[in-house]
Structures are given as C-alpha cells and as structure tokens.
C-alpha cells in the first residue's frame, strides 16, 4: 500500500510480488520524488485500489505501455 507522509508526497516502501492483469488496471502514476527511498509505480485498479509496483519489472513496464496506448486512443 502507498503511504502518504507529509502529504501530498506518496512513497512506496514495498512492491507487489504478484503480476496484475492489465484488464484490472485503470491508470498509473510514477513516483520519482526525491523524498522517497524507492522509485515506484502506483497502479490504480478498476475498483480504485492503489498498488505499488517495481518499475524495473517487465510486466510493470508493459502495463504502463498498455495504459499509455489506451490514453492515446480515444474511445469511440
């Protein structure tokens, strides 16, 4: 779970060890704050749950890529 210390800075201290299906993901944001001990990605699921993930993992990069493409392609 993300942890907000001195809001609005949110940091991740642990990453999920489970790969999440892209169908369950709604959006993401990158955590690159100099106040945080680790670079991270926070995925928001379709049920609004936030999950910390390791940006170095391929499934995380692929999921961000997928979400980026969804954002670029307007739904008709």
């Amino acid at each position: 779970q993300p942890d907000a210390i001195n809001a609005p800075v949110t940091c991740c201290y642990n990453f999920t060890n489970r790969k999440i299906s892209v169908q369950r993901l709604a959006s993401y944001r990158r955590i690159t704050s100099s106040k945080c001990p680790k670079e991270a990605v926070i995925f928001k699921t379709i049920v609004a749950k936030e999950i910390c993930a390791d940006p170095k993992q391929k499934w995380v990069q692929d999921s961000m890529d997928h979400l980026d493409k969804q954002t670029q392609t307007p739904k008709t």
Partner: antibody, heavy 121, light 109 residues
C-alpha cells in the same frame, strides 16, 4: 537568488582522480530536490552522470558511471562528484543541476556555469 | 534512449521549426522536458511535463506528444532562438543512461 557554482575542475593525467564540488546558495537542501551532475564533452551533447536526493541522500547512477563516479551530499549546501580512473573520454564541462521541485519529471530549472575537466598526459 | 531529429536545421526569421524526440519505449504523456543551450552557457529549461512552459519562457515555444513521440515547435522564430535544443526523459530516474536526446542545432538565417 538561487544559484549553483561548480568548482574543482582541473587538468588531470589518465588514471588520475578528481573531486568536483557543487555549492548551492539562495536555497537549502532541506527542501527536497534531485541534485545531479551532467557532463558535456567538447562539441557534444549532454550526458547525465548521477543524481542524489538533497533530503534523504538516495543516489542513482548512469550504468557507465557506477563504480568509477561517486555522488555525495557533503553538507546542507554542497554536493560532490568523486571521479576515479579518469580517461581522455572523461574530458568535458561538468555541470551541477537541480530539479524544479522534488519530482524527477519537472526538469532541471537551475544549472551551474560548469567546470572544465581535462584528462591528458 | 532518446533520439532527436533533425541533428541540424536552418530557418528564416519569422519561420517555424519542429524538432522531434523519440523515446525507445513509452514514457507516458507528461514526462518529457526540453532545453535550449547557447555556446558557453549551461542549458536553460524551456518546457517540462511535455507541454508546460517553464517560468519566463516565451509562448512561441510549444511542446506536445505522448508515448514515444514528442515534438518541440518554435513559431515566429527570432535570431535569439539560434541554439542547440535537447529533450530529456523525466519518466524514470533509475535509468539515467541516454536520458537526454542528442541535440538539434537551430540556425536562424
């Protein structure tokens, strides 16, 4: 006003070592930023070397710089870059740069004028 | 890695210049910065977050793009715009290699 000044650039022999210092004024590292070293060889482009969090000291390096270059926060207003096993290819102007705020994605809005490192026998 | 095109471009005063920056993998839609550098000077931040103008920068500079393709457009070019322009990824700090593009030299005639 906010300012960065690099010092320590010099003529050094191959395999030599050198420490560069970046001194900040007009702001304090207690406000968190990414402080980075960027170099530029004569007539070439910009190359990121390493970055350090001004508040908690987390460091990141370019893969080629790991082991040979060390970035450190030495006081509340200074960041250093220790360079070892220098080669002719390390000849460049070395800039100190600071991000606009604590996030990496906001770019470097503050730069020093640079300090020249020349590696030659 | 960030690839910039063209390496050099000539433009007349009042013209428009378009510089492209391509990322080797998607960096999202708000993780790119642009800089202007003149000889003997450090770079100057023009745009961050892909399209946000840095403080004091003319609105003649416009950034756009997302995913892997990004563009800097300079309209109503002035002599003072003669410089080298660099893009920089702001998506990940844990991979600093080739964070900057190779640069584009803009020559104003």
């Amino acid at each position: 006003q906010e300012q960065l000044v690099e010092s320590g650039g010099d003529l050094v022999k191959p395999e030599g070592s050198l420490t560069l210092t970046c001194t900040a004024s007009g702001f304090s590292f207690s406000t968190s930023y990414w402080m980075c070293w960027v170099r530029q060889a004569p007539g070439k482009g910009l190359e990121l070397i390493a970055c350090i969090s001004s508040s908690i000291g987390v460091t990141y390096y370019a893969s080629w710089a790991e082991g040979r270059f060390t970035i450190s926060k030495t006081s509340s207003t200074t960041v250093t870059l220790q360079m070892t096993s220098l080669t002719v290819a390390d000849t460049a102007t070395y800039f100190c740069a600071r991000t606009t705020d604590d996030n990496w994605n906001v770019g470097f809005n503050l730069w020093g004028p640079g300090t020249l490192v020349t590696v030659s026998s | 890695d960030m690839t910039q095109t063209p390496a050099s471009v000539e433009v007349g005063v009042g013209g428009t210049v378009t510089i492209k920056c391509q990322a080797s993998q998607s960096i999202g839609n708000r993780y790119l910065s642009w800089y202007q550098q003149k000889p003997g000077q450090p770079p100057k931040l023009l745009i961050y977050g892909t399209s946000t103008l840095a403080s004091g920068v003319s609105s003649r500079f416009k950034g756009s793009g997302s995913g892997t393709q990004f563009t800097l457009t300079i309209s109503g070019v002035e002599c003072a715009d003669s410089a080298t322009y660099y893009c920089q990824q702001g998506a990940t700090i844990s991979y600093l290699d080739n964070a900057f593009g190779g640069g584009t030299e803009v020559v104003v005639k």
